[in-house]
């Protein structure tokens, strides 16, 4: 028997220092967690430890801090060349910068194979691309070679920016014709990596016929045998196991995401490849495990630049930008109606010509707006300024609900009015009116939504039985300030861009901003 | 002994076919991969086909694809190619070999060739 | 597909040289080539495999370097029997490739 260890992580996004608990900007140092110098020290304990290792990364390095906005992915590839990492496969984030924004900062210049089977380059880009990311990769472990197989939400087009050059493949349909050449080049250990989420990590398992491990990502799933060590709920056993169509058990892990756990996978393969046992659990890492001096040395040079561009201009506003608690947990607020254009306008993807846009529409609970921006200095915007309007460094994420559910949502929005709660909802491509004189749960008179199919958008009544699509923070898709019926009732979430980096985007794209309350919510009485 | 045997080569006319035969004794023929290469004559070898220990993925060289069919039968210990539609620029001596135990494929038994001539 | 660039395509060398042939490959391959000796009439035999480990019951004369696009055999002192063409072989992807060869010679 041939015993293998998988370290893994995936949805880093950005997490290059380490973090509070919840992932957000460390303050007590002594309770953080995470951080590439952390989890440095942590994976060459066990390379020391153990003879054959490998450290895989199951994609979405890419965005979720300011070390994403201003490196743009040069960090990325410095970090994970400095940690060795063995394999990373394509995120759909990893396309957040168009694809000269993957080549030139992280295919170009990592030391490791980065993979995705079913993406294939078209047009002029297939010879630009082509050898910078590959299908799979055969890697040498001690005396054996284990296969790697790649794979990337074929969502891509519609969660991030990867052009008309790409065309995103069915999964199971790409992979199955790379694991049978890998079979027959004699490489009887195969590992799936790849970023699609847990439910296709399950049926690649099921359905892939020589995979013998599949190393997830994309939906941050939490697998745990035993009591859990922080606060993540698991979603399952470590490792959740699938029974094959050709009745193999096939293990499936995640590390939850942002760096706070370091996956850690037993494997014992018998001579011709086959899983006879595997067992693990993330490692949690927190501050018992020291951050070596050398990549910590190495994060504080790079956090330099940082600290400069946190203050620079990013753009100007010539109207009082009013974020305030009074406006935006009562009423429609100009702030409110900036974040919302922003997160659809970094939501615009021409993928269909029937549809102007797949999206039109965003919320975003009144409560998440922590700070105004005063226009009287000089109009100046800086980071900085942002970064106290979205403290939380959340995302603004794309779901689909069904239209009873988007009621519920909005019911909820006013079920309490007037105490200044968190719930009550700023909105885009929204006209909605409420009567506060009838009951709760009743208060939604009139609630119209702008049309994605249609080439001169105009707002029609919500269908209750139709699927939309949404644009939210990720507060609110995980059932934050009560909106357990969206967590619940969601068709589907894909997890989106850092929230600052969204606004800063607009911000700068749009260089001087006015945003007006123009009606998008309204108060009546009586009868409609 | 470990062993491969080829049979079946010969001399063929443009357009016909032949098949070739390749036995195998010495080892467990079903663990693994087998190939054809063939050389011309004066000439470097050239991979044509492999086909997978249980005899599912095939793979083919450009120059042979859609004519040659590799085949094998486990219970006789025996690897075949199948050839259609020759030409004279097949004219080769073709030997079957193993692709060895563990990757990356090495052909690390061969057979002694059989010769096939194609000519008017 | 992956083309295998051998040189020199023949050498002229006396027994108890040093004799190396390299084998250049169009793409990365990492270190997934194979090094096989041919003697006239005769069937390719296995000298090296994975860039450098050799194989079982091959002289320890041949050894084989490099990973990537840049491969060597040398044959540390020639011994009248290692006159033969020597082939390199890729099996990093399908179609497998061979490289041209390369015959040593008696000087």
């Known amino acids: 028997a041939w015993e293998l260890t998988i370290l893994h992580t995936n949805d880093v996004h950005s997490r290059l220092e380490q973090t509070s608990e919840d992932s957000s900007k460390c303050v007590n140092a002594s309770r953080c967690m995470g951080g590439v110098a952390r989890l440095f020290t942590k994976v060459q304990q066990i390379r020391r430890a153990e003879p054959n290792v490998l450290l895989l990364d199951a994609g979405d390095q890419y965005q979720g801090t300011i070390w994403f906005t201003v490196y743009k992915g040069a960090e990325v590839a410095h970090f994970m060349n400095a940690l060795r990492y063995d394999a990373m496969a394509l995120g759909n984030h990893e396309f957040d910068n168009g694809v000269e924004g993957l080549i030139e900062p992280l295919l170009k210049e990592a030391k490791f194979p980065i993979l995705s089977a079913n993406i294939k380059a078209k047009g002029p880009l297939a010879s630009q691309i082509s050898g910078l990311y590959l299908p799979y990769k055969v890697l040498p472990v001690g005396d054996e070679v284990v296969g790697i197989v790649g794979y990337t939400s074929k969502e891509t087009p519609f969660l991030s920016n990867p052009g008309t050059n790409l065309v995103f493949e069915d999964e199971i349909t790409a992979l199955q014709p790379e694991v049978d050449k890998l079979k027959t080049l004699n490489v009887n250990k195969i590992i799936a990596l790849g970023h699609s989420g847990f439910e296709m990590d399950k049926l690649i398992a099921q359905k892939v016929r020589g995979v013998d491990v599949v190393v997830g990502g994309h939906s941050n799933t939490f697998l745990y045998t035993g009591n859990p060590p922080s606060k993540e709920v698991p979603a399952g056993k470590y490792p959740f196991i699938v029974t094959s169509d050709d009745g193999r058990k096939v293990p499936v892990v995640q590390a939850y995401a942002f760096g706070k756990y370091l996956g850690y996978l037993k494997i014992e393969f018998d001579e011709r490849g086959n899983v006879i046992s595997s067992h693990g659990n993330p490692i949690l890492l927190n501050s018992s495990i020291p951050e070596d001096p050398s990549i910590k040395a190495d994060i504080n040079k790079w956090r330099i630049k940082l600290d400069n561009y946190s203050t620079q201009e990013l753009g100007k506003t010539i109207v009082y930008l009013d974020g305030s608690s009074q406006s935006c947990r009562f009423r429609e607020c100009n702030m409110g109606n900036l974040i919302c254009d922003a997160m659809i306008n970094n939501n615009l993807r021409h993928t269909d010509e029937m549809f102007w846009n797949h999206v039109s529409m965003c919320i975003l609970n009144g409560g998440g707006i922590r700070s105004p921006i005063d226009e009287r200095n000089n109009g100046t915007i800086t980071w900085e300024n942002l970064a106290a309007v979205l403290p939380f460094g959340g995302t603004f994420d794309l779901v689909q609900l069904k239209g009873s559910t988007l009621k519920k949502a909005f019911e909820h929005s006013v079920h309490r009015y007037g105490q200044s709660t968190g719930e009550f909802l700023q909105v885009g491509g929204i006209h909605v009116v409420y009567d506060l004189s009838r009951k709760p749960g009743d208060r939604v008179v009139k609630l119209d939504v702008l049309c994605t199919k249609c080439r001169v958008p105009s707002y029609d009544p919500l269908k209750m039985d139709e699927v939309y699509k949404v644009i939210l923070p990720n507060f609110l898709a995980n059932g934050g300030d009560g909106f357990q019926m969206i967590k619940d009732e969601l068709l589907r979430h894909d997890s989106g861009d850092q929230d600052i980096n969204v606004v800063s985007t607009y911000i700068s794209k749009m260089k001087v901003i006015y945003p007006a309350v123009e009606g998008r919510i309204k108060f009546s009485t009586g009868s409609h | 002994e470990v062993q491969l045997l080829e049979s079946g080569g010969g001399v063929v006319q443009p357009g016909r076919s032949l098949r070739l035969s390749c036995a195998a004794s010495?080892?467990?023929?079903?663990?693994?991969?087998m190939h054809w290469v063939r050389q011309a004559p004066g000439k470097g070898l050239e991979w044509v086909a492999v086909?997978?220990?249980?005899?599912?993925?095939?793979y083919y060289a450009d120059s042979v694809k859609g004519r040659f069919t590799i085949s094998r039968d486990n219970s006789k210990n025996t690897l075949y190619l199948q050839m259609n539609s020759l030409r004279a620029e097949d004219t080769a001596v073709y030997y079957c070999?193993?692709?060895?135990?563990?990757?990356?494929?090495?052909?690390?038994?061969w057979g002694q060739g059989t010769m096939v001539t194609v000519s008017s | 597909d992956i083309q295998l660039t051998q040189s020199p395509s023949s050498v002229s060398a006396s027994v108890g040289d040093r004799v190396t042939i390299t084998c250049r490959a169009s793409?990365?391959?990492?270190?997934?080539l194979a090094w096989y000796q041919q003697k006239p009439g005769k069937a390719p035999k296995l000298l090296i495999y994975?860039?450098?480990s050799l194989q079982s019951g091959v002289p320890s004369r041949f050894s084989g370097s490099g990973s990537g696009t840049d491969f060597t055999l040398t044959i540390s002192s020639l011994q009248p029997e290692d006159f033969a063409t020597y082939y390199c072989?890729?099996?990093?992807?399908?179609?497998?490739?061979f490289g041209g060869g390369t015959k040593v010679e008696i000087k």
């Open positions: 994975a860039a450098s």
């Open positions: 086909i997978n220990d249980e005899g599912i993925n095939k």
């Open positions: 010495g080892f467990t023929f079903n663990f693994y991969g």
């Open positions: 072989q890729q099996a990093n992807d399908f179609p497998i490739t």
């Open positions: 793409q990365d391959i990492s270190s997934w």
């Open positions: 070999a193993r692709g060895g135990a563990r990757y990356p494929i090495a052909f690390d038994i």
